[in-house]
């Protein structure tokens, strides 16, 4: 028997520094968690300990602080490189910056292969990025070869800007031949290694015949076996076993997200190749955990040009900039309503002909906008700015939800109007009026919506079994500030971009800003 | 585009010596472990030596232990393979191989890019 340890990670998302058990900004540094540093200790005093080790990474390094916005993904190839990951995958969000974006920071900077097996590149891009990431890579580790095979979620062109010359083909139709093209080589252990989400991750661990392990993200699931270490509660065991179409016992893992734990999976192969044995768990990055010195003392080197980057202006408000409770809790707030274009605005993706846009929608919780900006102050508007407006570090995510879903969102939005709580909601794209004499649960007297599949944009009543795309705050797709319906009932939900790097890209393009209060929130009393 | 190019093969008597060289372009050496490979007439082509990009660490066949040495230039994207002491069964092609990884072995399946090949002939 020859024996595997996989340890892997997934949605990093920017988290080179440690951070608090909620994965925002670290706090108290005695209670923070994961970064860079911390993760290079773990694996060296693993590396030392195990014989066979492969570091792996399933995709969205890219996209969620401060470092990536300043750095644009030459950190991740920077720091990657430093703890000698063995092979990553791409996910959805490497695409954040369009494909020069992956190509110049990323793609020709890591020293170790990058993978993906349904990305195909057409045209002029085919020869630009031919051999900078491959299908599968073959690794020697010890006296063995295992494969890595790499796939992407084929929604990426709605989630991210890989461009037209990307076509992301599906998943398991395009792994099985180069399993396949694997196994010619004499490659008789496989990993698949990628990013689609969990879902996808167990139907290739079913149907790609010759995949031995699945190490996936997307889905920021967390698995764990026993009593689980922290807040995360596990959607399985770890691994998770899947059986295949073909009789095999097949491990399946994810290590939920943002660099809070490392994924720790010891398999055993017969020599046949086959996998006699799994086990393992994500290991919780907390601070009993050193920081190693040496990534600490270059993640403390690359920091100084963040903390100049945030003072700097991004655009100028020639409008007071209302983010006050006292209006984004109680009516249409202009904040609320720049946010929410900004929103949109990171969402234009003209992937069909049919639709102007394949997402036309945004709600926000009003008690998501913690701070106002003076445009007193030259009008200068700053990422520190921005960092008071919005300090949740949150992401601004895509969902599917049916339109009966939305009017509960909405009648929630007012069930006990007047008391300044966070769930009244901000739009754009929309067009609500409320009727507050009448009871709650019944007060959304009308709820109109702009038409994506039209090429001249226009209001609509909203339709109870329809499906609509919606940008929302993941805060609210998780079910916060009493927004279950969402949490319960929404049919799909990609995570985006972070909040902060949202506003400010669109302050930036704009150059200069003057939202309005222009009714898109109405109230009235009376018949209708 | 990337390439690999043999050189310094010949003809040359058992005891002899020859340094081959492997020039890359096309990306950059540092980032890339090198192997040789050889293939003799009616024979599968098999694992030489290589060299590992992160720490150098390298890798022989135990059949020229001892005989043959692989070094690397990165400023120059040369790696060349020193072979003294040839013997009659050292005659074959040989190649150069890269993959973008730290370290290397002599296993075919995990190299990227392959070059044309150099004759080495050792004859008496």
């Known amino acids: 028997a020859w024996e595997l340890t996989i340890l892997h990670t997934n949605d990093v998302h920017s988290r080179l520094e440690q951070t608090s058990e909620d994965s925002s900004k670290c706090v108290n540094a005695s209670r923070c968690m994961g970064g860079v540093a911390r993760l290079f200790t773990k694996v060296q005093q693993i590396r030392r300990a195990e014989p066979n080790v492969l570091l792996l990474d399933a995709g969205d390094q890219y996209q969620g602080t401060i470092w990536f916005t300043v750095y644009k993904g030459a950190e991740v190839a920077h720091f990657m490189n430093a703890l000698r990951y063995d092979a990553m995958a791409l996910g959805n969000h490497e695409f954040d910056n369009g494909v020069e974006g992956l190509i110049e920071p990323l793609l020709k900077e890591a020293k170790f292969p990058i993978l993906s097996a349904n990305i195909k590149a057409k045209g002029p891009l085919a020869s630009q990025i031919s051999g900078l990431y491959l299908p599968y890579k073959v690794l020697p580790v010890g006296d063995e070869v295992v494969g890595i095979v790499g796939y992407t979620s084929k929604e990426t062109p709605f989630l991210s800007n890989p461009g037209t010359n990307l076509v992301f083909e599906d998943e398991i139709t395009a792994l099985q031949p180069e399993v396949d093209k694997l196994k010619t080589l004499n490659v008789n252990k496989i990993i698949a290694l990628g990013h689609s989400g969990f879902e996808m991750d167990k139907l290739i661990a079913q149907k790609v015949r010759g995949v031995d392990v699945v190490v996936g993200g997307h889905s920021n699931t967390f698995l764990y076996t026993g009593n689980p270490p922290s807040k995360e509660v596990p959607a399985g065991k770890y691994p998770f076993i899947v059986t295949s179409d073909d009789g095999r016992k097949v491990p399946v893992v994810q290590a939920y997200a943002f660099g809070k734990y490392l994924g720790y999976l010891k398999i055993e192969f017969d020599e046949r190749g086959n996998v006699i044995s799994s086990h393992g768990n994500p290991i919780l990055l907390n601070s009993s955990i050193p920081e190693d010195p040496s990534i600490k003392a270059d993640i403390n080197k690359w920091r100084i040009k963040l903390d100049n980057y945030s003072t700097q202006e991004l655009g100028k408000t020639i409008v007071y900039l209302d983010g006050s409770s006292q209006s984004c809790r109680f009516r249409e707030c202009n904040m609320g309503n720049l946010i929410c274009d900004a929103m949109i605005n990171n969402n234009l993706r003209h992937t069909d002909e049919m639709f102007w846009n394949h997402v036309s929608m945004c709600i926000l919780n009003g008690g998501g906008i913690r701070s106002p900006i003076d445009e007193r102050n030259n009008g200068t508007i700053t990422w520190e700015n921005l960092a008071a407006v919005l300090p949740f570090g949150g992401t601004f995510d895509l969902v599917q939800l049916k339109g009966s879903t939305l009017k509960k969102a909405f009648e929630h939005s007012v069930h006990r109007y007047g008391q300044s709580t966070g769930e009244f909601l901000q739009v754009g794209g929309i067009h609500v009026v409320y009727d507050l004499s009448r009871k709650p649960g019944d007060r959304v007297v009308k709820l109109d919506v702009l038409c994506t599949k039209c090429r001249v944009p226009s209001y609509d009543p909203l339709k109870m079994d329809e499906v609509y795309k919606v940008i929302l705050p993941n805060f609210l797709a998780n079910g916060g500030d009493g927004f279950q319906m969402i949490k319960d009932e929404l049919l799909r939900h990609d995570s985006g971009d972070q909040d902060i790097n949202v506003v400010s890209t669109y302050i930036s393009k704009m150059k200069v800003i003057y939202p309005a209060v222009e009714g898109r929130i109405k109230f009235s009393t009376g018949s209708h | 585009e990337v390439q690999l190019v043999e050189s310094g093969g010949g003809l040359v008597q058992p005891g002899g010596s020859l340094r081959l060289s492997c020039a890359a372009s096309?990306?950059?050496?540092?980032?890339?472990?090198i192997g040789w490979f050889r293939q003799a007439p009616g024979k599968e082509r098999e694992g030489v030596s290589c060299?590992?990009?992160?720490?150098?660490?390298?890798y022989y066949a135990d059949s020229v232990k001892g005989r043959f040495t692989i070094s690397r230039d990165n400023a120059e994207n040369t790696v060349w393979l020193q072979m003294n002491s040839l013997k009659p069964e050292d005659t074959a092609v040989y190649y150069c191989?890269?993959?973008?990884?730290?370290?290397?072995?002599?296993?075919?399946?995990?190299?990227?890019?392959w070059g044309q090949g150099t004759q080495v002939t050792v004859s008496g």
């Open positions: 191989a890269a993959l973008k990884y730290y370290y290397c072995s002599g296993h075919e399946a995990i190299y990227d890019y």
């Open positions: 096309g990306f950059p050496l540092d980032y890339y472990s």
């Open positions: 060299i590992g990009s992160s720490d150098g660490s390298t």
